[in-house]
Interface confidence: medium
């Protein structure tokens, strides 16, 4: 391979100028042609000067692994995902998080002591003896005798639960 | 580049606490990700046991709720398990890990008198 | 907690053969995380999210499922490779199978 500029890349024994980026090469120069250039479709993107003859596929943000586009792709520069509210990173990917998780809620039994936000966990204190949280979303958590189709029942101090009746 | 460093003793007594700490250079523990410790037992079998999220928040395995704590130093950049009333059956290899991309490399604790 | 069932416990292997190493959960999850773990060494994560490739694994590594059976897929087996496997799953608390090993022929 020919040893090639910086701004070049090879080409057969020859040397091309490089695209620039947000550019594709369309077709490689020639003895009396430069490099054609054409630019990348929506959807797709290349950060640098190259020789690529595609644009790379920008990446997709999947809200199923708790992600959202925190930086929309650009002809020049990939989309970034982050975490989406209520979660957080567990694995990253170069300089970007590729899978998060939902904070933790409540459990029944629980009431939700200070809520989950993009940058603070949930926060969970067990219900009081003869209370209950029927989901563990609840802030307050419920007297027994308030509401005749629940039966608390206990599974130990600050642990009531509930069960249908 | 991230790296996670576990340290404390390696022989502890039946029913004394095991304590153990993670150095992690490269990341800040506030920043972002859960800080987790999993062990693994003789015969690989491996456990999650709890978790410190960068908010200072905990979640636990059920199964050790009663006897697990885990804290951090963030001025130290380090977070710490603490297991009480340990038993020969807490023998293993401890890990300390962020999120599931970057684990330490373990340390060895063997429970016996 | 949900219970992870890998099999087989043990697979042994030719190199260049494919493998399929299969991951079946008591209930079902979001995703599936798989760790390669060689002797003396802490596991490594090698797909997360039922099919993306960790950073510098190699691509003969896959995987696929969905619900509660998931699988991992070495299309060409090499010396390397022999190590035990986990599945992982983290839509709950976290819970790990417990492991198939690769041995090379």
């Known amino acids: 391979l020919p040893s090639c500029k910086e701004d070049e890349y090879p080409v057969g024994s020859e040397c091309c100028p490089k695209c620039g980026p947000g550019f594709h090469v369309r077709q490689a120069c020639g003895e009396q042609t430069g490099t054609v250039c054409e630019p990348c479709s929506p959807g797709t993107y290349i950060a640098h000067f190259n020789g690529l003859s595609k644009c790379l596929q920008c990446q997709m943000c999947d809200p199923a692994m708790g992600l959202r586009t925190s930086r929309n792709c650009s002809t020049t520069a990939n989309a970034l995902c982050g975490c989406s509210p209520g979660h957080f990173c567990i694995i990253q990917d170069g300089d970007h998080c590729a899978a998060c998780r939902a904070y933790a809620t409540s459990s029944p039994g629980q009431r939700v002591q200070k809520g989950g936000t993009e940058s603070q966990d949930t926060l969970c204190q067990n219900c009081p003896p003869g209370t209950f949280s029927s989901n563990g979303t609840l802030e307050e958590c419920q007297h027994g005798t308030k509401c005749s189709k629940w039966l608390v029942t206990e599974a130990g101090p600050g642990t009531s639960s509930f069960r249908w009746v | 580049d991230v790296q996670l460093q576990e340290s404390g003793p390696g022989l502890v007594k039946p029913s004394q606490s095991l304590s153990l700490t993670c150095t992690v250079t490269?990341?800040?523990?506030?920043?972002?990700?859960?800080w987790n410790w999993i062990r693994q037992f003789p015969g690989n079998k491996l456990e999650w046991m709890g978790y410190?999220?960068?908010?200072?928040?905990?979640s636990y395995n059920p199964s050790l709720k009663s006897r697990i704590s885990i804290t951090r130093d963030t001025s130290k950049n380090q977070f710490f398990l603490q297991l009480n009333s340990v038993t020969a059956e807490d023998t293993a290899t401890y890990f300390c890990?962020?999120?599931?991309?970057?684990w330490g490399q373990g340390t060895s604790v063997t429970v016996s008198s | 907690q949900i219970v992870l069932t890998q099999s087989p416990a043990i697979i042994s292997a030719s190199l260049g053969e494919e493998v399929t190493l299969t991951c079946s959960a008591s209930?079902?999850?979001?995703?599936m995380h798989w760790y390669q773990q060689k002797s003396g060494t802490s596991p490594k994560l090698l797909i997360y999210?039922?099919?993306n490739l960790a950073s510098g694994v190699p691509s003969r590594f896959s995987g696929s499922g969905s619900g509660t059976f998931y699988s991992l897929t070495i299309s060409s087996v090499e010396a390397e490779d022999a190590a035990d496997y986990y599945c992982?799953?983290?839509?709950?608390?976290?819970?790990f199978g417990a492991g198939t090993k690769l041995e090379l022929k």
């Open positions: 410190i999220v960068y908010s200072g928040s905990t």
């Open positions: 992982h799953q983290w839509s709950s608390y976290l819970t």
């Open positions: 209930s079902s999850v979001s995703y």
């Open positions: 890990t962020r999120g599931m991309d970057y």
């Open positions: 490269g990341y800040s523990i506030t920043s972002d990700f859960a």
């Open positions: 999210s039922t099919s």
